[in-house]
């Protein structure tokens, strides 16, 4: 069934109640606008965002019989001349007969006849009409011969895009048969259709058909008004395309609308090939856009690449929201124009500061004012990590100028990164030279403390990621945040007595559910004597509260629990609600608070793991005291298990050489040999690609190498991620691997279809990657060797 | 063809205000904006300013903002410059140049001598 | 004084190619199109290039322009008698929201 079948089907089901064959129509209130009811249009209650009433009329093919419900009776079937009388085109069936054609339409033959409704004759231009009442023979007769189609075509034959031939010089009849049940034909819409006779069949057509013999490069040179268009898409090289076959619609800006753009902004645009071009493609779609079709709000691809979206609002169309087309519908051999008297400016055509909307003008106000938007200069490219306006805050505007210059060069970065560039544990450097890590989580990415809303957007010389919050570096380890803050003193204390401190001082990634010293009211000196003297009972506890990996509040999905898997080795939930992190349903007080080597969240109240059991009758006594929101399991005897540091290392190791290594001919019998074993690291991380976040898996297997030099005093193994420099690199003799990432696709840590969308909010279409697909990485050195 | 055509020239006494016209024919007048620029006795040229034939509207250059005033007359498709307060240095052969934007000064007109001089 | 600096003349002789620069800054030719135009001795001026390189209508082919950052130049290939005139460059300036013009450049035939 064809889309106008279907809508019809649906109005037959809306008037059913009204008896046999009645189908509902909705009339726009105050106009004589009528469209068949579609399931949307019924349930909004509206087209165009216009009211409508709901009128009852006979379907198609149907009449009313007297004293009988619906429209029980078949309309009489008569040749086309005699059918134009049946479906009320009077003033065509009157000028059918002056003109001659009516011998044409009663006698043999097959036809179509878009037949103008009495008011479409009304509506059009009095001296087009005097003139062809004036010559019936020729020019009536071929005007009504250009509404006529030589076989019999119905709704269901009328395909989108076709291009009949008239009965008038084979001049073309464009069809479009949109998704809406609206079917046009020149872009008059269909408004009575399928009315079978017994030579063809009759569709009344809302608009008297004008001849088309332009293009729609024609009509830019022959209209003064569009001469600024004209000369734009004859700088951009594409008036001549627009001389070609298609089915283009044009949003053409009058010269007007051009003397409404800063005159600044078009000098920059015209100055620049890339610009004007997108600037020019954004006012083309590929397809035939009749304003008749427009019925609600929809997206369309533009030349360009971007989209823009078409509404109306009652008789008015609107572009992006904005109420801007002057003139409807002006069809040519090639297309349609509609007139607009703005100019649409492309994402693709603006300059990085003029992307940011409304809800970021105080970021873009601060950056002009403390002279940084001069140095966003527009050959260049930059990303700007904008904040929304209520993330700052009246203490942050009223800061020391030097102070704020320094808080929004944090959101200014070197480089260009768009949305689909962005991976987990990623470095981003700003201009400020401050260094940013990302962070991918299943619907949110986030950037040190702050995570992203929708709305970015790619300009000419760089992108925008809006923000919640300001974006703040962290300056302080774990450890060191914890150290001066005084409410943590009782679990620092508790962390060094269990040799953890190092673990929060070294480089790495952790989430730290810190408890206050709160958690620990009521624990007597005794009892504190108690938990540090069985230290295996202390470092379970403690890594209980240490989770591997960078876990921000606000990147959770809100409602929704996740379960982490602690250092200790024991799963944790956590929870965002309203604003609020729940870590084992219990309140976080503080959360988000970045460190150079991870994040910590404060809680009032100590963790444990509701899995592990204890076996000892006083440390069960202190742990209820201070553990409330959970039954610890009593097992007698029950030990815990040492957890074993060395996991827990950053991967990288850094070899430490004392002593350069003298690399010299060895004589035989002078070697010293020492074999170095690397067990195989595995690195994961999140990467977005072609807009998919996905996880990838390193897996670099450390060969053993033999390292041979007599004068070497001795080599340490160390832990922790620190520069090695030239020694490292003359020591490894520039090794060069290749490393292959395994993607592992469709696993719970990816984002799902939906989130995607409404994350990358219709950036680019995004595209799955095949499980295991092999994606070969970069050449470059390695200092584990060989990767596997 | 398009044609600008500019009033005579003009002697003024410094303080004085002059005005100039500019009637504009063969293609539709409100459809393009007109720019107004002025060159001294042997210099370069200085752009004024312009003004929109459709609705009016004006951008002035920042040096004459306050002494200058541009409008148009629709009806006969003329295109006014008022300069007021004039100084010796306001010398110059004053031009006006149909100005579409996208194409800029694309015709002028021949241009209009005012002598400022006590 | 002018924002756009031009060299004060350039010369040739019939058929050589001549070329005229203009130096600008980052908020009017490093930001903006660069347009040229040529006046004739005693007479109005006349659009000659737009937005970097582009010719009006009846504007022979042996004018040519470009742009590079902060600065723009004009060749005129062929050199003829009649190309004798002042050539001005104009761009927008950002900073000073107004429309600049070099200092213009007299091109002689020699």
């Known amino acids: 069934n064809s889309y106008y079948d279907k809508v019809l089907a649906h109005s037959r089901i809306r008037g059913r109640d009204q008896g046999p064959n009645v189908c509902a129509l909705q009339q726009i209130l105050g106009t004589k606008k009528k469209y068949f009811s579609s399931c949307k249009n019924w349930y909004q209650g509206a087209i165009c965002g216009k009211k409508t009433t709901v009128l009852y009329e006979c379907c198609p093919g149907y009449m009313r019989m007297e004293g009988m419900k619906g429209c029980p009776a078949v309309m009489p079937i008569d040749h086309v001349y005699g059918t134009l009388g049946i479906v009320g085109a009077t003033t065509t069936q009157h000028y059918s007969d002056v003109s001659k054609l009516r011998e044409e339409i009663e006698g043999k033959g097959s036809y179509t006849y878009f037949a103008p409704s009495n008011e479409a004759w009304e509506n059009l231009d009095s001296d087009i009409r005097r003139g062809l009442e004036n010559n019936v023979n020729v020019e009536l007769l071929n005007a009504l011969h250009s509404h006529m189609v030589n076989k019999r075509m119905l709704t269901k034959d009328l395909k989108h895009g076709m291009v009949i031939p008239s009965m008038y010089n084979n001049l073309g009849l464009f069809i479009n048969h949109y998704p809406n049940g609206v079917v046009t034909v020149n872009c008059a819409r269909v408004i009575h259709g399928n009315q079978i006779a017994t030579n063809g069949v009759v569709h009344v057509i809302d608009r008297v058909l004008t001849q088309i013999g332009t293009s729609i490069q024609d009509f830019l040179e022959a209209e003064d008004d569009l001469s600024s268009f004209r000369a734009a898409a004859i700088t951009s090289d594409l008036l001549e395309s627009l001389g070609r076959d298609g089915h283009f619609t044009l949003f053409a800006p009058t010269n007007e609308a051009f003397e409404k753009l800063p005159r600044g902004v078009l000098e920059r645009i015209m100055g620049d090939k890339v610009a004007s071009e997108a600037l020019m493609k954004y006012h083309i779609l590929n397809t035939l856009q009749c304003s008749e079709a427009i019925t609600g709000g929809a997206v369309f691809e533009t030349m360009e690449g971007n989209t823009i979206e078409i509404g109306c609002e009652g008789d008015s169309i609107s572009i992006n929201g904005i109420k801007m087309v002057n003139k409807k519908d002006i069809v040519t051999k090639n297309g349609v124009i509609h007139l607009i008297d703005e100019v649409l400016i492309p994402d693709s055509a603006k300059q990085v500061i003029e992307l940011a909307g409304k809800q970021q003008t105080t970021f873009t106000d601060l950056v002009a004012q403390l002279g940084l938007a001069s140095s966003l200069k527009p050959d260049g490219e930059y990303t700007l990590l904008a904040p929304v306006n209520n993330a700052f805050s009246d203490d942050t505007l009223s800061m020391d100028q030097r102070l704020l210059k320094l808080i929004l060069q944090n959101h200014i970065l070197k480089v260009k990164v768009g949305l689909s560039d962005l991976y987990n544990g990623q470095i981003l450097e700003t201009i400020g030279g401050k260094q940013l890590r990302v962070f991918v989580y299943r619907t949110a990415i986030c950037i040190e403390n702050s995570c992203m809303v929708r709305g970015s957007k790619q300009g000419r010389n760089g992108a925008i990621h809006i923000f919640r919050e300001i974006i703040q570096p962290a300056e302080k380890s774990l450890h060191d945040k914890l150290r001066q803050d005084k409410r943590f003193s009782i679990f620092l204390s508790l962390l060094e007595a269990a040799d953890l401190k190092d673990l929060l001082t070294q480089p790495g990634d952790w989430t730290l559910f810190a408890p206050t010293n709160d958690a620990f009211k009521g624990m007597t000196s005794e009892e504190r004597e108690l938990l540090i003297g069985d230290k295996n009972a202390l470092q379970n506890i403690i890594l209980y509260h240490l989770t591997p990996g960078v876990y921000i509040g606000k990147g959770f999905e809100p409602g929704v629990t996740n379960i982490l898997k602690t250092t200790q080795g024991s799963k944790i939930y956590l929870k965002g609600v309203n604003e609020t992190l729940l870590v084992n349903e219990l309140k976080s007080k503080e959360s988000d608070i970045m460190t150079t080597n991870g994040v910590i969240h404060v809680v009032d109240k100590l963790l444990y793991p509701a899995d592990i059991p204890v076996g000892n009758d006083q440390l069960l006594e202190l742990l209820n005291k201070l553990i409330k929101y959970i039954q610890i399991k009593f097992v007698r005897g029950s030990t815990f298990k040492e957890i074993p540091m060395t996991v827990y290392r950053p991967a990288m190791t850094k070899i430490q050489i004392e002593g350069d290594p003298d690399f010299r001919l060895i004589k035989e019998g002078e070697t010293v040999t020492e074999v170095i074993h690397g067990e195989p690291v595995i690195k994961k991380y999140t990467k977005i690609i072609d807009g998919v976040p996905v996880e990838i898996t390193e897996k670099q297997t450390r060969e053993e190498r033999i390292i041979t030099g007599p004068e070497i005093k001795y080599t340490r193994i160390s832990t922790g991620g620190g520069e090695t420099g030239e020694t490292l690199q003359k020591f490894l003799q520039k090794e060069v691997s290749k490393v292959t990432k395994f993607i592992e696709g469709g696993d719970g840590h990816l984002f799902e279809d939906e989130e995607i969308k409404r994350l990358l909010q219709g950036d680019t279409p995004a595209k799955k990657i095949p499980a295991n697909k092999r994606v070969q990485g970069p050449r470059r050195r390695s200092r584990e060797g060989r990767s596997q | 063809q398009v044609q600008l055509v500019q009033s005579g020239a003009e002697v003024k006494k410094p303080g004085a205000s002059v005005k100039v016209s500019c009637k504009a024919s063969?293609?539709?007048?409100?459809?393009?904006?007109i720019s107004w620029v002025r060159q001294a006795p042997g210099q370069g040229l200085e752009w004024m300013g312009w003004?929109?034939?459709?609705?009016?509207?004006?951008n002035y250059a920042q040096k004459l903002q306050g002494r200058v005033t541009m409008t148009t007359d629709t009806s006969t498709s003329t295109a006014y410059m008022e300069l007021r307060s004039l100084r010796s240095d306001d010398t110059a052969v004053y031009y006006c140049?149909?100005?579409?934007?996208?194409?800029?000064?694309?015709?002028w007109g021949q241009g209009t001598l005012v002598t400022v001089s006590s | 004084q002018s924002v756009l600096t031009q060299s004060s003349s350039a010369s040739g002789t019939p058929g050589q190619t001549v070329t005229v620069s203009c130096s600008g800054s980052?908020?009017?030719?490093?930001?903006?199109?660069v347009n040229w135009y040529q006046q004739l001795p005693g007479t109005a001026p006349k659009l000659l290039i737009y937005?970097?390189?582009q010719r009006p209508s009846g504007v022979p082919d042996r004018f040519s322009g470009s742009k590079s950052g902060t600065s723009a130049s004009l060749a005129i290939s062929g050199l003829q008698s009649a190309d004798e005139a002042d050539y001005y460059c104009?761009?927008?300036?950002?900073?000073?929201?107004?429309?600049?013009f070099g200092s213009g450049t007299k091109v002689t035939v020699l």
């Open positions: 063969g293609y539709t007048f409100t459809s393009y904006g």
């Open positions: 980052s908020s009017d030719i490093g930001s903006n199109r």
């Open positions: 003004i929109s034939a459709y609705n009016g509207n004006t």
């Open positions: 104009a761009a927008w300036d950002d900073s000073l929201s107004t429309y600049v």
């Open positions: 140049a149909r100005d579409m934007l996208v194409v800029p000064f694309d015709y």
């Open positions: 937005s970097n390189d």
